[in-house]
């Protein structure tokens, strides 16, 4: 028998520095977690102790903190090289700055193979990107070879900016011939490494003949066997065992997100490459693991540029940006409008001639807007200003919801109106009218939404049975501020870009902004 140790990360999202337990900015260092310096300590410890070790990343290193905003992927290549990753799969967020924003900082600089079997380049891009990412790689480990085959969510064109010269194929259809090739090369130990979410990971384990292990990402799935060491609630045991269609037991793993855990899976193979046993658990990277001093010093060196960036002007406002709780928790506020407009603008994807855009709606809990911005400072807006407005380090995500769920969400928005509570929704691409004289749960009297399948966008009444795409904070997608109906009833959830980054990009693009209060949210006569 031959034993392989797979160390894995996914959805690190720019958390190069240690973070608090909830993966936001580290405040009390003695209770902070993760970060590349701490990760390196643990990886090196395992490499020294065990003979056959692979360090793999399942995508979405890009996007999530000011590190990505400033360094645009160069930080990912630099620190992944320093940690000596063996391979990485492309995630959807790796395309956030377009194909060029992937090629130059990451693909050309990474000292490890970057993989995806279901992304096919065409046109002029085909020769430009040739060899910079691969469908699979055969890695030598000890006296054996291990095949790693990559995959990426086929929804990427709706979630990011891959352009028109990359085709995202069905994962299973694309993976099978590549796995067959590996088998033809006498490679009998094969890992599928990719970024399509836990449901697809399980399908790959079930359907792709020859895959021995699946290491996934995208859905931030936490798996654990035994008592979990932190706040994350396991979605199943680690590894999650899937019985393939040809009767094999295939371990499937994922390691939550944000570099909080290091996935640790031990696989035993027989001489024919069959998995005999698999066991392990994610390792919580808490403060009991010291940060590696040389990596930490490097982080501190790179950090300097971030501090300078946060005080630079992004753009100007010529109006007061009202982000006060007195406004945003009671009525339409122009800060809410600005943020929602930025959220929609960030998700412009012309992927179908029938649609002017794939999504037109935004909702945003008023309690998530934490500060106004005064225009009487020469109109200057900095990253620092935006960090006061959006201090929680969240993301603006894409969900699919039925009209009936949206209606419930808007009823929840005003179910206890007047108490300055955070659930009051700010909107974009939505016109809502409330009648507060009616009883809670029956206060939405008009709810019109902006069409997407139209050449001239206009507002139509919400249809209860129709499925709509909506951009919203991850906080709401996870049921925060009492929006349990969103969490329970959402049909799809894809994590998006860092909230501050979305707004800062929009302001930089617009240069001068002047958001108004324009009647998106109304109260019917006599009720307010």
């Amino acid at each position: 028998a031959w034993e392989l140790t797979i160390l894995h990360t996914n959805d690190v999202h720019s958390r190069l520095e240690q973070t608090s337990e909830d993966s936001s900015k580290c405040v009390n260092a003695s209770r902070c977690m993760g970060g590349v310096a701490r990760l390196f300590t643990k990886v090196q410890q395992i490499r020294r102790a065990e003979p056959n070790v692979l360090l793999l990343d399942a995508g979405d290193q890009y996007q999530g903190t000011i590190w990505f905003t400033v360094y645009k992927g160069a930080e990912v290549a630099h620190f992944m090289n320093a940690l000596r990753y063996d391979a990485m799969a492309l995630g959807n967020h790796e395309f956030d700055n377009g194909v060029e924003g992937l090629i130059e900082p990451l693909l050309k600089e990474a000292k490890f193979p970057i993989l995806s079997a279901n992304i096919k380049a065409k046109g002029p891009l085909a020769s430009q990107i040739s060899g910079l990412y691969l469908p699979y790689k055969v890695l030598p480990v000890g006296d054996e070879v291990v095949g790693i085959v990559g995959y990426t969510s086929k929804e990427t064109p709706f979630l990011s900016n891959p352009g028109t010269n990359l085709v995202f194929e069905d994962e299973i259809t694309a993976l099978q011939p590549e796995v067959d090739k590996l088998k033809t090369l006498n490679v009998n130990k094969i890992i599928a490494l990719g970024h399509s979410g836990f449901e697809m990971d399980k399908l790959i384990a079930q359907k792709v003949r020859g895959v021995d292990v699946v290491v996934g990402g995208h859905s931030n799935t936490f798996l654990y066997t035994g008592n979990p060491p932190s706040k994350e609630v396991p979605a199943g045991k680690y590894p999650f065992i899937v019985t393939s269609d040809d009767g094999r037991k295939v371990p499937v793993v994922q390691a939550y997100a944000f570099g909080k855990y290091l996935g640790y899976l031990k696989i035993e193979f027989d001489e024919r490459g069959n998995v005999i046993s698999s066991h392990g658990n994610p390792i919580l990277l808490n403060s009991s693991i010291p940060e590696d001093p040389s990596i930490k010093a490097d982080i501190n060196k790179w950090r300097i540029k971030l501090d300078n960036y946060s005080t630079q002007e992004l753009g100007k406002t010529i109006v007061y940006l009202d982000g006060s709780s007195q406004s945003c928790r009671f009525r339409e506020c122009n800060m809410g409008n600005l943020i929602c407009d930025a959220m929609i603008n960030n998700n412009l994807r012309h992927t179908d001639e029938m649609f002017w855009n794939h999504v037109s709606m935004c909702i945003l809990n008023g309690g998530g807007i934490r500060s106004p911005i005064d225009e009487r400072n020469n109109g200057t807006i900095t990253w620092e200003n935006l960090a006061a407005v959006l201090p929680f380090g969240g993301t603006f995500d894409l969900v699919q919801l039925k009209g009936s769920t949206l209606k419930k969400a808007f009823e929840h928005s005003v179910h206890r109106y007047g108490q300055s509570t955070g659930e009051f929704l700010q909107v974009g691409g939505i016109h809502v009218v409330y009648d507060l004289s009616r009883k809670p749960g029956d206060r939405v009297v008009k709810l019109d939404v902006l069409c997407t399948k139209c050449r001239v966008p206009s507002y139509d009444p919400l249809k209860m049975d129709e499925v709509y795409k909506v951009i919203l904070p991850n906080f709401l997608a996870n049921g925060g501020d009492g929006f349990q109906m969103i969490k329970d009833e959402l049909l799809r959830h894809d994590s998006g870009d860092q909230d501050i980054n979305v707004v800062s990009t929009y302001i930089s693009k617009m240069k001068v902004i002047y958001p108004a209060v324009e009647g998106r949210i109304k109260f019917s006569t006599g009720s307010h």
Epitope: R84, F112, P113, G131, V138, T184, L185, N186
Partner: antibody, heavy 118, light 107 residues
Framework: QVQLVQSGAEVKKPGASVKVSCKAS????????IYWVRQAPGQRLEWIGW????????KYNEKFKGRSTLTADKSASTAYMELSSLRSEDTAVYYC???????????WGQGTLVTVSS | DIQMTQSPSSLSASVGDRVTITCKAS??????VAWYQQKPGKAPKLLIY???TRHTGVPSRFSGSGSGTDHTLTISSLQPEDFATYYC?????????FGQGTKLEIK
């Protein structure tokens, strides 16, 4: 463009050692195998072994195990092949080559002639 | 080790001819066969891998076929620059092995 540039011709006495270098450029050195292949006069090509610069893993053809040493200097993007206890039948052109994606040889160095003669 | 045997060892042909070179493996190598062209004093050049996939920049007159133990390289219409020695290689398992070569000469 991918280039592999090898060191110059060598003449060695039986029992001596030779070290041939292969300087890579035009791609990320750590991401592809470097293979060593030799060709004795009028003979077929013979695979000596590989080194994978990413993790410095080495695999030898059993025939060359013990006499051949493959190394790589990542910072210089250079691979080396040393052959010891040379005999006259080791007279050959030694090539380094790079894979496309494992097991076939897509790009070749220009070759280094090693002559073993007393 | 897998032995690769090429035939013929040499052959003479004219410009415009269709030429076929065969390679027999001592055991099943599936479709894991590559073909190389070598000219005197030069390094070999990859023509084909995976039995029938042409390497970048290789003219379409070169094609490969076969599976299992029997593999073939075909040049559909010989050009003056095609006169050289051709080698097959199995990339199925280590040690990777080559055929003894087929020398293609001008008739």
């Amino acid at each position: 463009q991918v280039q592999l540039v090898q060191s110059g011709a060598e003449v060695k006495k039986p029992g001596a050692s030779v070290k041939v270098s292969c300087k890579a450029s035009g791609y990320t050195f750590t991401n592809y195998y470097i293979y060593w292949v030799r060709q004795a006069p009028g003979q077929r090509l013979e695979w000596i072994g590989w080194i994978y610069p990413g993790n410095l893993n080495i695999k030898y053809n059993e025939k060359f195990k013990g006499r051949s040493t493959l190394t790589a200097d990542k910072s210089a993007s250079t691979a080396y092949m040393e052959l010891s206890s040379l005999r006259s039948e080791d007279t050959a052109v030694y090539y380094c080559a790079r894979d496309d994606n494992y097991a076939w040889f897509a790009y070749w160095g220009q070759g280094t002639l090693v002559t073993v003669s007393s | 080790d897998i032995q690769m045997t090429q035939s013929p060892s040499s052959l003479s042909a004219s410009v415009g001819d269709r030429v076929t070179i065969t390679c027999k493996a001592s055991q099943d190598v599936s479709t894991a066969v590559a073909w190389y062209q070598q000219k005197p004093g030069k390094a070999p050049k990859l023509l084909i891998y995976w039995t029938n996939t042409r390497h970048t920049g290789v003219p379409s007159r070169f094609s490969g076929s076969g599976s299992g133990t029997d593999h073939t390289l075909t040049i559909s219409s010989l050009q003056p620059e095609d006169f050289a020695t051709y080698y097959c290689q199995q990339h199925y398992s280590t040690p990777f092995t080559f055929g003894q070569g087929t020398k293609l000469e001008i008739k």
